[in-house]
């Protein structure tokens, strides 16, 4: 059973209290307000909106509202020197331009500071060469290009799909096969579903839509000149050439209009199978070069952006709890965005901005909550995470000691056909609990919980009877709190049928067309969608902040463990012979998590057990779960990732946005069998196996009873 | 002392269902994971379910999938056994046991004493 | 067909030591703790053996367990016409996420 009990106030104000206030009609508002003009970071719009929220979050009650600048690495196009992409002939004249902006959508064609399409953070350059065809650039890929066809990408310029992975890893890996640019574009396959039509029609992309993105590896590094530490005013930077995860090659995107045009002449070798096909008329050969009559034409990118450091600015809220004010549950959502940001960030903000609403009710109605919630309004996440990485550089020191628990509030949608989470095995309770108290919005499950309508359209594909519930990645805010500083977090969102709807992300994403009007006709007519994000988001934050017993369970740790000992062990079973001649044992990891069961068990039991009327044990038993995140953190973080310190989960080294249970294992077994030195490279999984079997052990041991 | 006490056994025609309750006592039953073991008359053990200390994460035998469901009740201290398209090699004693590390399979230090489940027309 | 195998039946006479072989594979015994349990006729499985040589508290020491790659053993000293039963070997498949138990072996002290 939820807690939900209340602080110094009458038994009225508790969870119902707090989810009752909560209206549809206002996220509705605030997402019309916060969506007018572009809000991209480092802009003057931008700054006047953090102040408008500040202002709004002071009259909704909280205790104070303040704003924290830093003064971050951040890339803008030349407003005089557009970039784009051409054809030259063998003259060197531009027989094709791509175009230096998106058609803009209804309504908007006089709204003024539209970034045109651009890839944040690449380098300035006009590499020309020929085109090879590299499907979504993905490590598996290269592979197929490289070892399976023998097609040598060094000195070319590749162009790959948007999809499957963060795009940061895309251009990693075309910069590690040697290319000298890259292109980037939407692939109807992807980005249209069919039988939907183009913006402003529904809500698929049109040909002349562009996603802009930043292609960053910084692997949690905050700004890329002030890595570890905040940017303040008397920090240090580095030189733009030490910068962390800065492209060294150009990199552009575009529509599919003028994908087209460049993938209609390729010629050289055909794809290798249908998965290298998208939904154009061409032919999709891989190059290199362009087909038999264009073979003297080549490509040639202009690209003239520029990096500045530029100021940004953070919104942090504050109510202070009345029971345990030192204790910090944080719920955070950016505020930037590419252009009018419809969906990404501001249907995020605008369920924020109506859960800091109904919080600030109750408590001018007297009410507190019992640890202290903390909400932030990040500034330029589109640039790499920057506004929540920096405040959690600046600090740190009270994080670790303080913070519970961090939920996300990105995008409050990506589809409208059920529930998405990802989070830490020790909310797994939370969420399930919470899910089966609240209403479902969908159709055909009108009087059922929000529980039984995702676990019929997302079961979980382990454990029959469940919802899937995913592991935490990367590629938003709750980064450098869970993977650098190992506190508890989780996200939740509406998303798509995944089953029917492969295209990635939603097909809108980052263009211009995300606008306000996407979201009211197509997505979420009557905010239904919205209003239960709201409720599982804030839901969460106020059991996070209100039980008295904090609402973790660690025996769902326990459970994940041995299932990702398992996986990880078939893994490495795939290499026998290798195993018995290095010696490789996991012997010591399965041990551990054998020990991490017991001791958790015998820890829920102790926790069902113990005078909760005592605050010294009560504080105690809340630390040791407060403090169990905070034990699978490696202070000396993965192998070249520093600011990647959970030894449980990380961003995948081949797709940012997805997480990788036992990673230092995982990437250590990679490929293993196409290292030079096979000794080393298992000397380095036994080492990892190490690292996971201690931490797995320490972090059991902080649950042992204290004396 | 721990108890483990089955019931719900009975006859049923293949393709009915039947289900089986296990009242647990003397251990906090929350904490532990819970399966159910089965024997077919005069054949060896065999394992057909289990479900997770916790929130309750469940595993199943290849052949029972899809047609049994196995599920708990912290606050009653009671584990059940949704049997549902029974067939004739479904008949056996059905035992309850209750793992002796925690929230995942390791070892049953526990066990009932079995429910009898005939499947026949 | 059991994933563990392990032999029909062993007999001894009386006083006698007896063994039990538990043959699996790298995903089950290879990596996993193993356990055993008696079975007299007519009752519930006892656990015997945990955590490949551990006996649980009232267990004689007559009964111990070992473990060495994809095969586990339990032996039995000082055999007594008490011991005749069925024996069990169990243990977790890391690969199928499942309890696996060998066939069962009779034991019959002659």
């Known amino acids: 059973k939820s807690s939900n009990e209340a602080t110094n106030i009458t038994p009225k104000h508790n969870m119902k209290a707090f989810l009752d206030e909560l209206k549809a009609e206002n996220i509705k508002k605030f997402l019309y307000n916060f969506t007018q003009i572009p809000h991209l970071a480092g802009t003057e719009q931008n700054f006047q909106l953090a102040k408008q929220i500040q202002s709004q979050w002071k009259e909704f009650g909280l205790d104070s509202v303040e704003l924290a600048h830093y003064d971050v690495l951040l890339s803008y196009p030349n407003k005089t020197h557009p970039n784009y992409i051409s054809i030259i002939n063998e003259d060197g004249n531009e027989i094709f331009n791509t175009s230096l902006f998106e058609p803009p959508p209804p309504g908007y064609e006089n709204v003024s500071d539209i970034v045109p399409p651009f890839s944040a953070f690449s380098p300035q350059g006009m590499p020309e060469g020929d085109l090879v065809y590299v499907n979504y650039a993905r490590t598996e890929d290269f592979f197929k290009l490289e070892r399976d066809m023998k097609i040598n990408c060094s000195g070319k310029i590749v162009i790959a799909r948007y999809g499957k992975v963060f795009r940061g890893n895309k251009v990693k890996n075309a910069q590690l096969a040697g290319a000298k640019g890259v292109i980037l574009y939407s692939d109807p396959a992807d980005y249209f579903a069919p039988g939907v039509k183009s913006y402003p029609d529904g809500w698929n992309l049109p040909g002349g839509g562009v996603q802009r993105g930043n292609i960053l590896n910084l692997n949690g590094a905050g700004d890329p000149l002030t890595p570890g530490y905040p940017a303040n005013e008397y920090a240090y930077r580095r030189g733009i050439a030490e910068a962390v995860g800065l492209p060294s090659i150009p990199v552009h995107p575009i529509g599919y209009y003028d994908a087209q045009k460049l993938l209609e002449k390729m010629g050289g070798s055909a794809p290798p199978d249908s998965s290298w096909r998208g939904s154009l008329k061409v032919p999709y050969n891989v190059g290199p070069g362009f087909t038999g009559n264009f073979s003297t034409q080549k490509v040639k990118m202009h690209i003239h952006s520029t990096n500045e450091v530029t100021r940004i600015y953070n919104v942090i809220g504050t109510l202070r709890g009345a029971v345990e004010p030192d204790r910090y549950v944080i719920l955070g959502g950016h505020r930037d965005s590419w252009v009018f940001g419809g969906i990404d960030p501001q249907s995020g903000a605008a369920v924020v901005h109506e859960i800091v609403r109904s919080f600030g009710t109750l408590k001018k109605e007297g009410w507190r909550p019992r640890r202290t919630i903390l909400f932030a309004s990040w500034d330029a996440e589109e640039f790499g995470l920057l506004g929540s990485t920096e405040w959690a550089e600046e600090n740190s020191r009270l994080l670790q000691e303080r913070g519970v628990a961090y939920i996300n509030a990105d995008s409050s949608i990506e589809g409208n056909y059920t529930l998405r989470v990802d989070c830490t095995p020790l909310m797994y309770s939370l969420v399930h609990n919470l899910t089966k108290e609240l209403k479902s919005p969908d159709e055909g499950f009108e009087g059922k919980s929000l529980y039984e309508s995702w676990t019929k359209k997302s079961p979980s594909p382990e454990f029959s009877g469940m919802p899937r519930i995913s592991k935490l990645g990367s590629g938003n805010d709750f980064e450098v709190f869970f993977q650098r500083l190992g506190i508890a977090s989780g996200r939740a969102r509406y998303t798509k049928n995944w089953e029917t709807n492969k295209f990635s992300g939603y097909p809108l994403y980052h263009s211009v067309y995300e606008t306000y009007e996407l979201v009211e006709k197509f997505y979420d007519p009557m905010f239904k969608y919205h209003l239960t994000v709201a409720q599982v988001r804030g839901g969460m934050v106020f059991e996070l902040a209100n039980s008295i017993v904090l609402p973790f369970d660690c025996r769902d740790y326990a459970v994940v463990l041995r299932k990702y000992a398992d996986k990880i062990y078939s893994i490495s079973m795939k290499h026998p012979q290798e195993m018995k001649t290095y010696s490789v044992s996991f012997d010591s990891l399965f041990s551990a998590v054998k020990n991490f069961t017991e001791i958790a068990s015998k820890f829920s039991e102790r926790l069902q057990d113990f005078d909760k009327s005592n605050p010294i044990v009560l504080r105690m038993m809340n630390d040791q779960l407060m403090f169990l995140e905070r034990a699978f953190i490696d202070p000396l973080g993965l192998p070249d990732r520093p600011f990647y310190r959970h030894v449980i989960y990380a961003p995948s080294s081949h797709n940012k946005y997805a997480g990788e249970s036992f990673p230092g294992i995982y990437d250590a077994l990679f490929d293993i069998e196409s290292k030079v030195d096979p000794s080393k490279a298992w000397g380095e999984v036994k080492r990892q196996i190490y690292v996971a079997a201690f931490t797995v052990q320490a972090a059991a041991e902080t649950l042992s009873e204290v004396a | 002392e721990v108890q483990l006490v089955e019931s719900g056994g009975g006859l049923v025609q293949p393709g009915g269902s039947l289900r089986l309750s296990c009242a647990a006592s003397?251990?906090?039953?929350?904490?532990?994971?819970m399966s159910w073991v089965r024997q077919a008359p005069g054949k060896g053990l065999e394992w057909v379910s289990a479900i997770s200390g916790g929130s309750g994460s469940t595993y199943y035998a290849d052949s029972v999938k899809g047609r049994f469901t196995i599920s708990r009740d912290n606050s009653k201290n009671t584990l059940y056994l949704q049997m549902n398209s029974l067939r004739a090699e479904d008949s056996a004693v059905y035992y309850c046991?209750?793992?002796?590390?925690?929230?995942?399979?390791?070892?049953?230090?526990?066990w009932g004493q079995g429910t009898l489940v005939t499947v026949s027309s | 067909q059991s994933v563990l195998t392990q032999p029909p039946s062993v007999s001894a006479a009386p006083g006698q030591k007896v063994t039990i072989s538990c043959s699996g594979s790298s995903s089950n015994i290879g990596i996993n703790y193993v356990s055993w349990y008696q079975q007299l006729p007519g009752t519930a499985p006892k656990l015997l053996i945990y955590d490949n040589n551990k006996r649980p508290s009232g267990i004689p020491d007559r009964f111990s367990g070992s473990k060495s790659g994809t095969s586990a053993t339990l032996g039995i000293t000082g055999l007594q016409t008490g011991d005749e039963a069925d024996y069990y070997c169990?243990?977790?498949?890391?690969?199928?996420?499942?309890?696996?138990f060998g066939g069962g072996t009779k034991l019959t002290v002659l």
């Open positions: 046991a209750k793992d002796g590390v925690g929230a995942t399979p390791y070892y049953f230090d526990y």
């Open positions: 169990g243990t977790w498949d890391s690969s199928l996420s499942a309890v696996v």
């Open positions: 003397g251990f906090t039953f929350s904490s532990y994971a």
